[in-house]
Amino acid sequence: LQDPCSNCPAGTFCDNNRNQICSPCPPNSFSSAGGQRTCDICRQCKGVFRTRKECSSTSNAECDCVPGFRCLGAGCAMCEEYCQQGQELTQKGCKDCCFGTFNDQKRGICRPWTNCSLDGKSVLVNGTKERDVVCGPSPADLSPGASSVTPPAPAREPGHSPQ
């Protein structure tokens, strides 16, 4: 004998309590295959998840992540903080580092450029949103006959590249 429930198409369920008639899945639920006796609960894309595809009677909702996060795991099971270098994550998503700060990673916050003058050094390479300044030896260190007791020349403030 054929199971009468096998006639129930996707989007319906076979009602255990009503002579195995096919009934449509209720709102916020679905059945992706025929012959099911229960409908599955639709996934809800909340918090850092956002809806990529709405739930239908035959397929589950699909989620992706809000800006600043990327999907991890099968079916975007989790969202991971993820910005570009030169950015930091804020409540409104990824934002470029402010002038004078940098972030050389795809997570974390923007940090101030190193102040070369605090170490008595000069700026060898200007800083960017993605990279810290590179400090070089002070001008006095580069002059001929300089000794260790020579007082350092006044250091320049860190330079920068246009943002």
Partner: antibody
Framework: QSVEESGGRLVTPGTPLTLTCTVS????????MTWVRQAPGKGLEYIGI??????TYYASWAKGRFTISKTSSTTLELKITSPTTEDTAIYFC??????????????????WGPGTLVTVSS | AAVLTQTPSPVSAAVGGTVTISCQAS????????LSWFQKKPGQPPKLLIY???SLASGVPSRFKGSGSGTQFTLTISDLESDDAATYYC????????????FGGGTEVVVK
């Protein structure tokens, strides 16, 4: 139609524990099944449910702490991944009868198993 | 997540009397009706009394009556018997894939 839990015992904190729910007279593919617990002196607490097709749904506090799985058409498991003393409770398994014919879990939990006691202590 | 607030415990009444237990939900349950009532005695599993707010479960005496809709629900036990002494819980069904069900805190009924 009946439900029975097993596997409850004394465990030390952090030691995973798997509880088993064995049903008779019906198939797990035909109904939603739920796990509920009651800690000493406390009320009933919903842990999670599994649909007839095997999809699982958890209370927000239980996500990551518990795993519900189906091992056969008549056997359901609840794994407590890393028990703490707060997980000491009687654990119940119940079928959602869906007597109103909604086609999904409705809260008409019946029948229930007698429960199995889990004690987490060092 | 939704919260179900039940009548403070304990509620007491004499044999033959009537008790009314309320269950107030912070959000409407699915279909305004998916709320169940359970009786729980020490050492026993919960017993389904009412489903879908007002439907009497199989084998439950008609002395138990459920009513209400949306966010406000009531369980009334009339012609109280000593065997009715127990803690009663409501549980609501919500449109969520996480906190799909929420239990109330329970109400103890004392029969004098």
């Amino acid at each position: 139609q009946s439900v029975e839990e097993s596997g409850g015992r004394l465990v030390t904190p952090g030691t995973p524990l798997t509880l088993t729910c064995t049903v008779s007279g019906f198939s797990l593919s035909d109904y939603y099944m739920t796990w509920v617990r009651q800690a000493p002196g406390k009320g009933l607490e919903y842990i999670g449910i599994m649909s007839g097709s095997g999809s699982t749904y958890y209370a927000s506090w239980a996500k990551g702490r518990f795993t519900i799985s189906k091992t056969s058409s008549t056997t359901l498991e609840l794994k407590i991944t890393s028990p703490t003393t707060e997980d000491t409770a009687i654990y119940f398994c119940a079928r959602d009868g869906d007597y109103a014919g909604w086609g999904y879990a409705t809260g008409a939990f019946d029948p229930w198993g007698p429960g199995t006691l889990v004690t987490v202590s060092s | 997540a939704a919260v179900l607030t039940q009548t403070p415990s304990p509620v007491s009444a004499a044999v033959g009397g009537t008790v009314t237990i309320s269950c107030q939900a912070s959000q409407s349950v699915v279909g305004n009706s998916l709320l169940s009532w359970f009786q729980k005695k020490p050492g026993q599993p919960p017993k389904l009394l009412i489903y879908s707010a007002s439907s009497l479960a199989s084998g439950v005496p008609s002395r138990f009556k459920g009513s209400g809709s949306g966010t406000q629900f009531t369980l009334t036990i009339s012609d109280l018997e000593s065997d009715d002494a127990a803690t009663y819980y409501c549980t609501g069904r919500y449109n969520s894939d996480t906190d799909t069900f929420v239990f109330g805190g329970g109400t103890e009924v004392v029969v004098k």
